[in-house]
């Protein structure tokens, strides 16, 4: 799978994580920090 950094317009897309652009899948993906989940890493769990 080809990946690259997200475009600058997606700054802030991932609330608590790193935004990765999955080129072949035509979508952005959030790699969440430890303790966070959700499509955009918006949910905190213990």
């Amino acid at each position: 799978v080809s990946i690259t950094k997200c475009n600058s317009d997606m700054n802030g897309y991932c609330l608590h994580g790193q935004c990765i652009y999955l080129v072949d899948m035509s979508q952005n993906y959030c790699r969440c920090e430890v303790g966070y989940t959700g499509v955009r890493c918006e949910h905190f769990y213990l």
């Epitope: 600058s8 317009d9 897309y13 035509s26 979508q27 952005n28 499509v39 955009r40």
Partner: antibody, heavy 116, light 106 residues
Framework: QDQLVQSGAEVKKPGASVKVSCKAS????????IQWVRQAPGQGLEWMGR????????KYRERFEGRVTITADTSTNTAYMELSSLRSEDTAVYYC?????????WGQGTLVTVSS | DIQMTQSPSSLSASVGDRVTITCKAS??????IAWYQQKPGQAPRLLIQ???TLQPGVPSRFSGSGSGTDYTFTISSLQPEDIATYYC????????FGGGTKVEIK
């Protein structure tokens, strides 16, 4: 099946406002950005602005600032684009477009006609 | 706002010809360019994103290349069904469409 279903065609008088809705199904708009694009008859595509429904943040093309308002109601999974002070040049098909989780998934378009 | 200058605005070519459309950005867009095909009365159809990545179901005669500010879209062998208007879109910093290229058959 993911869908963006837009409201029906509108006819407005110059100076009036129009509010176009874009209802999402099959996905949560909070996971995406919703963009708005328009196309006047026989003309090219023009990006108007976008909203991040999760945060409520909006960005607008400079020439529409102050005349366009993009909002989202996450409880109904619907985005809206309101354009005020309409003039004949605003006659166009208006599209909502999902981006973020999937690159550019388009609604069917809404024709807005501005005529006296 | 980033400006996208698309050329030519229209072209006429024969079936089987190689067709090339260019888009120049007013600043580096880091390969974040997409190409759309639009036929009359239809919504735009995404052909290519991230400069050269073909969407599923799009024929391999369509291709894209470029980097920095200069990008190219190519139809290697024009077919009658390719008659349409083509648009580039930069999506690095917000969004800007090129002015479009109307492709006709000679």
């Amino acid at each position: 099946q993911d869908q963006l279903v837009q409201s029906g065609a509108e006819v407005k008088k110059p100076g009036a406002s129009v509010k176009v809705s874009c209802k999402a199904s099959g996905f949560n708009i909070k996971d995406t950005y919703i963009q708005w694009v328009r196309q006047a008859p026989g003309q090219g595509l023009e990006w108007m602005g976008r909203i991040d429904p999760l945060r409520g943040n909006t960005k607008y093309r400079e020439r529409f600032e102050g005349r366009v308002t993009i909002t989202a109601d996450t409880s109904t999974n619907t985005a809206y684009m309101e354009l005020s002070s309409l003039r004949s040049e605003d006659t166009a098909v208006y599209y909502c477009v999902r981006s973020g989780t999937l690159f550019d998934f388009w609604g069917q378009g809404t024709l807005v006609t501005v005529s006296s | 706002d980033i400006q996208m200058t698309q050329s030519p605005s229209s072209l006429s070519a024969s079936v089987g010809d190689r067709v090339t459309i260019t888009c120049k950005a007013s600043q580096d867009i880091h390969k974040y360019i997409a190409w759309y095909q639009q036929k009359p009365g239809q919504a735009p159809r995404l052909l290519i994103q991230y400069t050269s990545t073909l969407q599923p179901g799009v024929p391999s005669r369509f291709s894209g290349s470029g980097s920095g500010t200069d990008y190219t879209f190519t139809i290697s062998s024009l077919q009658p069904e390719d008659i349409a208007t083509y648009y580039c879109l930069q999506y690095d910093n917000l969004r800007t469409f090129g002015g479009g290229t109307k492709v006709e058959i000679k």
